[in-house]
């Protein structure tokens, strides 16, 4: 059974990760960012179902992509925090927060979506299981 | 004090042309995105399309894709939307919207023109 | 594209009365949600940001509540100036997408 404080630690890391997703959504969903109409013509795969921890597979396998499309928003006049480190940060949280004990075959929905569509909904994952676990 | 004003409305017959500006005063016009939004009589809003401070993206509603072409000149404060191919549907009042932040777009639109009717009959 | 709906689609009150409209999206929007409020023959007027947020100039009587797919607008005690319809609109992505709106009207 989970206990108070292991309770608490994966609280903290669903804080940490929903504010690192809010912060790519926000650093690309703006007035000044020049690459958006191209960076909405990449399609993301999202989850048939995200209900629980061991969902966030389905994340871990899109980072990848999520970094290069990231990558190609970079200019002058936009700038994520280097994305290489913010990806590796998430990537770490998602392995401790599904934990490697069972490998998950992650199941997709039919339809793809973009990266403002990807994000936000793992964003509402987050915010789903954070609440429950208030 | 911040103000923008459309122009360019009036009555036109289907398929044919109109260009509707809005000139803009009172804060840093080539710092915010602007929209178009339009609400057709004794009907809900609807919004029409965005551009970019500097024009680099532009977005519209399906509807207008191909036909509507929105487009800025920032040396003139200057918004404008060129309407082409129009339709009886798109009759409507037409107002340009300041953001109410350059760089978020939850701050929704906090200043709007008072509009500029357009009329689409044969 | 985002669906937004709003209930009720019109709503008779009194002066001091406290009213709340509901507005729904089709899919999560987070707090990307922003709401006006609209006269006759007048264009909208910027009432609450980010689904909580005051713009500033307007009474402490308004406020915006929730997250992801569900939201409120409350307006605590109904004043005569009040009387208006009201419309919710997310700003996650484009196209941006409008409620039908909300008539607010004298009982």
């Known amino acids: 059974a989970p206990t108070s404080s292991s309770t608490k630690k994966t609280q903290l890391q669903l804080e940490h990760l929903l504010l690192d997703l809010q912060m790519i959504l926000n650093g690309i969903n703006n007035y000044k960012n020049p690459k958006l109409t191209r960076m909405l013509t990449f399609k993301f795969y999202m989850p048939k179902k995200a209900t629980e921890l061991r969902h966030l597979q389905c994340l871990e396998e899109e980072l990848k992509p999520l970094e290069e499309v990231l990558n190609l928003a970079q200019s002058k006049s936009f700038h994520l925090r280097d994305t290489k480190d913010l990806i590796s940060n998430i990537n770490v949280i998602v392995l401790e927060l599904k934990g490697s004990e069972t490998t998950l075959m992650c199941e997709y929905a039919d339809e793809t979506a973009t990266i403002v569509e990807f994000l936000n909904r793992w964003i509402t994952f987050c915010q789903s299981i954070i609440s429950t676990l208030t | 004090q911040v103000q923008l004003v459309e122009s360019g409305g009036g009555v036109v017959q289907p398929g044919r042309s109109l260009r509707l500006s809005c000139a803009a005063s009172?804060?840093?016009?080539?710092?915010?995105?602007m929209h178009w939004v339009r609400q057709a009589p004794g009907k809900g809003l609807e919004w029409v399309a965005v551009?970019?401070?500097?024009?680099?993206?532009?977005f519209y509603v399906d509807s207008v894709k191909g036909r509507f072409t929105i487009s800025r000149d920032n040396s003139k404060n200057t918004l404008y939307l060129q309407m082409n191919s129009l339709r009886a549907e798109d009759t409507a009042v037409y107002y340009c919207a300041r953001p109410g932040s350059d760089y978020y777009f939850y701050y929704g639109m906090d200043v709007w023109g008072q509009g500029t009717t357009v009329t689409v009959s044969s | 594209d985002i669906q937004m709906t709003q209930s009720p689609s019109s709503v008779s009150a009194s002066v001091g009365d406290r009213v709340t409209i509901t507005c729904r999206a089709s899919q999560g929007i987070s707090n990307w949600l922003v709401w006006y409020q609209q006269k006759p023959g007048k264009p909208p007027k910027l009432l609450i940001y980010a689904a909580s947020s005051l713009q500033n100039g307007v009474p402490s009587r308004f406020s915006g509540s929730g997250s992801g797919t569900d939201f409120t607008l409350t307006i605590s005690s109904l004043q005569t100036e009040d009387f208006a319809t009201y419309y919710c609109q997310q700003a996650l992505s484009f196209p941006w997408t409008f409620g039908p709106g909300t008539k607010v009207e004298v009982k």
């Open positions: 009172g804060f840093t016009f080539s710092s915010y995105g």
């Open positions: 551009i970019w401070y500097d024009g680099s993206n532009k």
